[in-house]
């Protein structure tokens, strides 16, 4: 028998520095977690103690904090090289800055192979990107070799900016021939490493003949055997065992997100490459694990540029940006309009001639808007200003919901109106009229939504049975502020870009902004 230790991360999302327990900015260092310096300590400890170790990343290193905004992926290559990752799969967020924003900082600089079997380049890009990412890699480990096949969510064109010269194929269809090639090469230990979410990970384990282990990402799935060490609630045991169509037991793993845990899986193979046993658990990277001093020093060196960036002007406002709770928790506020407009703008993807865009709607809890921005400071808007408006380090995500769920959400928005509660929704691509004289749960009297399958966008009444795409904060997607119906009834959820980054990019693009209160939210006569 031959034993392999797989160390894995996924959805790190730019958390190079240690974070608080909820993966936001570290405040009390003695209680902070994660970060590449701490990760390195643990990885090195395991490498010294065990003979056959692979360190793998399942994608979405890009996007999530000011580190990515400033360094644009150079930080990912630099610190992953320093940690000596063995391989990485491409995630959807790796395309956030377009293909060039992937090629130059990461694909050309990474010292480890970057993988995806289901992304095919065409046209002029084919020769430019040739060899910079691969469908599979044969990694020598000790006296054996291990095959790694990569995959990426085929929804990436709707979630990021891969352009028109990359084709995202069905994962299972694309993986099978690559696994077959590895088998032909007499590589009999094969890991599928990828970024399509836990449901697809399980399908790959079930359907792709020859895959022995699946290491996934995208869905931020936390798996654990035993008593979990922090706040995350396990979606299942670690590893999660799938019985393949040909009768094999295939371990599937994921390690939550944000570098909070290091996935740790031990696999025992027989001489024919069959999995005899698999066990492990994610390791919580808490403050009991010291940060490696040399990596920490490097982080501090790179940090300097971030501090300078946060005070630079992004753009100007010529109007007061009303982000006060007195406005945003009671009525339409122009800060809410600005943020929603930025959220839609960030999701412009012309992937189908029938649609002007794939999504037109935004909802945003008024309680998530934490500060106004005064235009009387020469109109200057900085990252620092935006961090006061959106201090929680969330993301603006894409969900699919039925009209009936949206209706429930808008009823919830005003179910206890007048108490300055955070659930009052700011909107984009939506016209809502409330009648507060009616009883809670029956206050939405008009709800019109902007069409997507149209050449001239216009507002049509919401259809209860229709499925709509909506951009919203991850806080709402996870049922925050009492929006349990969103969490319970959503049909799809893909995590998006860092909230501040979305708004800052929009302001930089627009240069001068002047959002208005324009009648997106109305109250029918006699009730307000």
């Amino acid at each position: 028998a031959w034993e392999l230790t797989i160390l894995h991360t996924n959805d790190v999302h730019s958390r190079l520095e240690q974070t608080s327990e909820d993966s936001s900015k570290c405040v009390n260092a003695s209680r902070c977690m994660g970060g590449v310096a701490r990760l390195f300590t643990k990885v090195q400890q395991i490498r010294r103690a065990e003979p056959n170790v692979l360190l793998l990343d399942a994608g979405d290193q890009y996007q999530g904090t000011i580190w990515f905004t400033v360094y644009k992926g150079a930080e990912v290559a630099h610190f992953m090289n320093a940690l000596r990752y063995d391989a990485m799969a491409l995630g959807n967020h790796e395309f956030d800055n377009g293909v060039e924003g992937l090629i130059e900082p990461l694909l050309k600089e990474a010292k480890f192979p970057i993988l995806s079997a289901n992304i095919k380049a065409k046209g002029p890009l084919a020769s430019q990107i040739s060899g910079l990412y691969l469908p599979y890699k044969v990694l020598p480990v000790g006296d054996e070799v291990v095959g790694i096949v990569g995959y990426t969510s085929k929804e990436t064109p709707f979630l990021s900016n891969p352009g028109t010269n990359l084709v995202f194929e069905d994962e299972i269809t694309a993986l099978q021939p690559e696994v077959d090639k590895l088998k032909t090469l007499n590589v009999n230990k094969i890991i599928a490493l990828g970024h399509s979410g836990f449901e697809m990970d399980k399908l790959i384990a079930q359907k792709v003949r020859g895959v022995d282990v699946v290491v996934g990402g995208h869905s931020n799935t936390f798996l654990y055997t035993g008593n979990p060490p922090s706040k995350e609630v396990p979606a299942g045991k670690y590893p999660f065992i799938v019985t393949s169509d040909d009768g094999r037991k295939v371990p599937v793993v994921q390690a939550y997100a944000f570098g909070k845990y290091l996935g740790y899986l031990k696999i025992e193979f027989d001489e024919r490459g069959n999995v005899i046993s698999s066990h492990g658990n994610p390791i919580l990277l808490n403050s009991s694990i010291p940060e490696d001093p040399s990596i920490k020093a490097d982080i501090n060196k790179w940090r300097i540029k971030l501090d300078n960036y946060s005070t630079q002007e992004l753009g100007k406002t010529i109007v007061y940006l009303d982000g006060s709770s007195q406005s945003c928790r009671f009525r339409e506020c122009n800060m809410g309009n600005l943020i929603c407009d930025a959220m839609i703008n960030n999701n412009l993807r012309h992937t189908d001639e029938m649609f002007w865009n794939h999504v037109s709607m935004c909802i945003l809890n008024g309680g998530g808007i934490r500060s106004p921005i005064d235009e009387r400071n020469n109109g200057t808007i900085t990252w620092e200003n935006l961090a006061a408006v959106l201090p929680f380090g969330g993301t603006f995500d894409l969900v699919q919901l039925k009209g009936s769920t949206l209706k429930k959400a808008f009823e919830h928005s005003v179910h206890r109106y007048g108490q300055s509660t955070g659930e009052f929704l700011q909107v984009g691509g939506i016209h809502v009229v409330y009648d507060l004289s009616r009883k809670p749960g029956d206050r939405v009297v008009k709800l019109d939504v902007l069409c997507t399958k149209c050449r001239v966008p216009s507002y049509d009444p919401l259809k209860m049975d229709e499925v709509y795409k909506v951009i919203l904060p991850n806080f709402l997607a996870n049922g925050g502020d009492g929006f349990q119906m969103i969490k319970d009834e959503l049909l799809r959820h893909d995590s998006g870009d860092q909230d501040i980054n979305v708004v800052s990019t929009y302001i930089s693009k627009m240069k001068v902004i002047y959002p208005a209160v324009e009648g997106r939210i109305k109250f029918s006569t006699g009730s307000h």
Epitope: D86, K108, E109, A110, K111, F112, P113, S130, G131, L134, P135, Y136, K137, V138, L139, P140, V141, G142, K181, T184, L185, N186
Partner: antibody
Framework: QVQLQQSGAEVKKPGASVKVSCKAS????????IYWVRQRPGQGLEWIGW????????KYNEKFKGRATLTADTSASTAYMELSSLTSEDTAVYYC????????????WGQGTLVTVSS | DIQLTQSPSFLSASVGDRVTITCKAS??????VAWYQQKPGKAPKLLIY???TRHTGVPSRFSGSGSGTEFTLTISSLQPEDFATYYC?????????FGQGTKVEIK
């Protein structure tokens, strides 16, 4: 573009050792295997072994095990092939090569290094 | 070790001819076969890998086929620059081995 530049011709006495270098450029050295192949005068091609500069693991043709040593210097993007206990049978052109996809054919070759073993 | 036997060892042909070279493996190698062209004093050049995939920049007149133990390299219309020695190689089992070569000469 991918280039592999090998060291110059060598003349060695029987029993001696030779070390041939192969400097890679135009790609990330640590991400691809370097293969070594030799061709004796007027003969066919013979695979010696490979090294993966990403973690310095090696694999040898049993015929060369114990005599050939493959190493790499990642800071210089250079691979080396050392062959010891030379005999006249080792007179050959030695090539380094790189693939496009792991193992699947040698796509890029060095220009070759002629090693002559003669007393 | 897996032996690869190429036939013919020598082949005389004219410009424009269709040329077929075969490579027989002593045991099955699935499709783990590559084909190379070598000219005197030069390093080999990869033509085909995975038995039938043309390497970037290789003219479409070169094609490969076969699986298991029998493989063929076909040049659909021989050009003056195609006169060279051709080698097959298997990378399915260690040690990786080459055929003895087929020299294509001008008739």
């Amino acid at each position: 573009q991918v280039q592999l530049q090998q060291s110059g011709a060598e003349v060695k006495k029987p029993g001696a050792s030779v070390k041939v270098s192969c400097k890679a450029s135009g790609y990330t050295f640590t991400r691809y295997y370097i293969y070594w192949v030799r061709q004796r005068p007027g003969q066919g091609l013979e695979w010696i072994g490979w090294i993966y500069p990403g973690n310095f693991n090696t694999k040898y043709n049993e015929k060369f095990k114990g005599r050939a040593t493959l190493t790499a210097d990642t800071s210089a993007s250079t691979a080396y092939m050392e062959l010891s206990s030379l005999t006249s049978e080792d007179t050959a052109v030695y090539y380094c090569a790189r693939d496009v996809y792991d193992y699947a054919g040698f796509a890029y070759w060095g220009q070759g290094t002629l090693v002559t073993v003669s007393s | 070790d897996i032996q690869l036997t190429q036939s013919p060892s020598f082949l005389s042909a004219s410009v424009g001819d269709r040329v077929t070279i075969t490579c027989k493996a002593s045991q099955g190698v699935a499709t783990a076969v590559a084909w190379y062209q070598q000219k005197p004093g030069k390093a080999p050049k990869l033509l085909i890998y995975w038995a039938s995939t043309r390497h970037t920049g290789v003219p479409s007149r070169f094609s490969g086929s076969g699986s298991g133990t029998e493989f063929t390299l076909t040049i659909s219309s021989l050009q003056p620059e195609d006169f060279a020695t051709y080698y097959c190689q298997q990378y399915s089992s260690y040690p990786w081995t080459f055929g003895q070569g087929t020299k294509v000469e001008i008739k």
